[in-house]
Every structure is written in structure tokens, then in C-alpha cells.
């Protein structure tokens, strides 16, 4: 269980997800751009 406070839907307060994946190479591209900064 998390030690930090929860919202009622179960996500820990302040836990930040990674950035959204980017697909810069058009419709044919299945692979996402790597992130320059990892969380």
C-alpha cells in the first residue's frame, strides 16, 4: 500500500507519469521517439 495520501480513485497524489509518446515520422512510424529526460 502507498504511504502517501490517495484520491478516491486510487492514484497516489503527486505521482507524475512520463511524458506522452511522440510519433514524429508520419503514418508509417510505429516506434515512439525516446525521451530526452527520464523520470
Amino acid at each position: 500500500s502507498y504511504s502517501m495520501e490517495h484520491f478516491r480513485w486510487g492514484k497516489p497524489v503527486g505521482k507524475k507519469r512520463r511524458p506522452v509518446k511522440v510519433y514524429p515520422n508520419g503514418a508509417e512510424d510505429e516506434s515512439a521517439e525516446a525521451f530526452p529526460l527520464e523520470f
Epitope: K11, R17, P19, V20, K21, V22, D29, E33
Partner: antibody
Framework: EVQLVESGGGLVQPGGSLRLSCAAS????????MIWVRQAPGKGLESIGI???????YYANSAKGRFTISRDNSKNTLYLQMNSLRAEDTAVYYC???????WGQGTLVTVSS | DIQMTQSPSTLSASVGDRVTITCRAS??????LAWYQQKPGKAPKLLIY???KLASGVPSRFSGSGSGTEFTLTISSLQPDDFATYYC??????????????FGGGTKVEIK
């Protein structure tokens, strides 16, 4: 061909509900981050919410408590359930594959009595 | 939620002009910023991601810069096809208390 096709838009009364669908082809929805975006007539783009590849969902303040994003992996389809609709929810709704040029054609939702 | 503020809202320019659009985030988003171009009745087109990287097929006259909270999109020499509306978009990670995906209000580039 990589493609997103939205459906389910239409005229709904204030307070009503609607479920939009976004059918994907050429890629697997569950492997990618998917965003719902809307655009009111003559206005700018507004992000509604995101479902990450792992199924985690997050919403803009304007959508929290009223809108729910889900997906059906077997149908390779994304959904936007919209409840307690208001006149200001009138817009073209797009589904988008992450940050990319993969946008659906949009579906118009009109909330009016 | 992250708020994105774009300026100007409308810009009048001529073919050949150098055009600069500014986008400000309400909190630091590192370089997780994209720029889109939209024409009437069409879905937006990705121009720039990661603040300064050109998406596939985008002409080199488009460039982006910035990090943290201040970003700019520059068109070095405006072409007839560039008259459109431009949007910045943050795509930073979301949390339960802050949604990280937001668009600026748009900048319409019109013919002077």
C-alpha cells in the same frame, strides 16, 4: 494504413450522455498513448484526457467527473463516455495517437435543447 | 492543469516575412512541447516536437526553441502555404493533481 475513425457524435440534450468511439487500424491502440481532443466551432484545440499504454487515465479539469476514457483491446477501439453534457461541450471531438499526425477525422457533438 | 498561453492571437504578415510566435507554460515542462499547424476544416499537422525537432516532411523554414516555460516557433520566410493557425501543445507527464497535456489558444497567421 494507419488510421483513426471516430463515430458516435450527434445532437444531444443538455444533461444527456453520449459515447464516442475511435476505431484504429494499422496499429494496436493498447500499445500507445491515446488522447482525446476537442474543438468548439471557430475556437481552439482543447485536450480532454489521455489513456496511457498501460491503461492509466488522466483528465483535464473540464472533463473530470463527467468524461471517461476507456478502450476495448479486442476491438482495437478507444471510447469517450460523456455524461452531464452542457452546451459548452458542443465541439468536434478528435482522437489522437500520442503526439503525432495520426488524428481521426473528428465527430461533431452538438448539445442543445 | 498546465496552462499554455500563446501570443499573439492574430498576426498579419506578408510572403517572405520572418514570423515569430511565443508560447508560455504555467509551470516548467522541460522540452515537452510540440507545435501544430491547422487549416480550416482539417485536422492539425505536427510541425515540431521536443521544442526544437522537426517532424517528418516539415520544411526547414520552420524552427522551434525554448525550454522550461518559454518557447518560440519561427518561420524564417513565410510562404503562401503557411497562412494558417498555429498551436503549441505541452505533453509533459500528468499526475492525479495536474493534467500535463494542454494547448495554447492558437495564433492565426493571416495575409497583411
Amino acid at each position: 494504413e494507419v488510421q483513426l475513425v471516430e463515430s458516435g457524435g450527434g445532437l444531444v440534450q443538455p444533461g444527456g450522455s453520449l459515447r464516442l468511439s475511435c476505431a484504429a487500424s494499422g496499429f494496436t491502440v493498447s500499445k500507445h498513448d491515446m488522447i482525446w481532443v476537442r474543438q468548439a466551432p471557430g475556437k481552439g484545440l482543447e485536450s480532454i484526457g489521455i489513456i496511457y499504454d498501460d491503461g492509466d487515465t488522466y483528465y483535464a479539469n473540464s472533463a473530470k467527473g463527467r468524461f471517461t476514457i476507456s478502450r476495448d483491446n479486442s476491438k482495437n477501439t478507444l471510447y469517450l463516455q460523456m455524461n452531464s453534457l452542457r452546451a459548452e461541450d458542443t465541439a468536434v471531438y478528435y482522437c489522437v495517437k500520442g503526439v503525432s499526425n495520426i488524428w481521426g477525422q473528428g465527430t461533431l457533438v452538438t448539445v442543445s435543447s | 492543469d498546465i496552462q499554455m498561453t500563446q501570443s499573439p492571437s492574430t498576426l498579419s504578415a506578408s510572403v517572405g516575412d520572418r514570423v515569430t510566435i511565443t508560447c508560455r507554460a504555467s509551470q516548467s515542462i522541460s522540452v515537452y512541447l510540440a507545435w501544430y499547424q491547422q487549416k480550416p476544416g482539417k485536422a492539425p499537422k505536427l510541425l515540431i516536437y521536443q521544442a526544437s525537432k522537426l517532424a517528418s516532411g516539415v520544411p526547414s523554414r520552420f524552427s522551434g526553441s525554448g525550454s522550461g516555460t518559454e518557447f518560440t516557433l519561427t518561420i524564417s520566410s513565410l510562404q503562401p502555404d503557411d497562412f494558417a493557425t498555429y498551436y503549441c501543445q505541452s505533453y509533459d507527464g500528468s499526475s492525479s493533481s495536474s493534467y500535463g497535456v494542454g494547448f495554447g489558444g492558437g495564433t492565426k497567421v493571416e495575409i497583411k
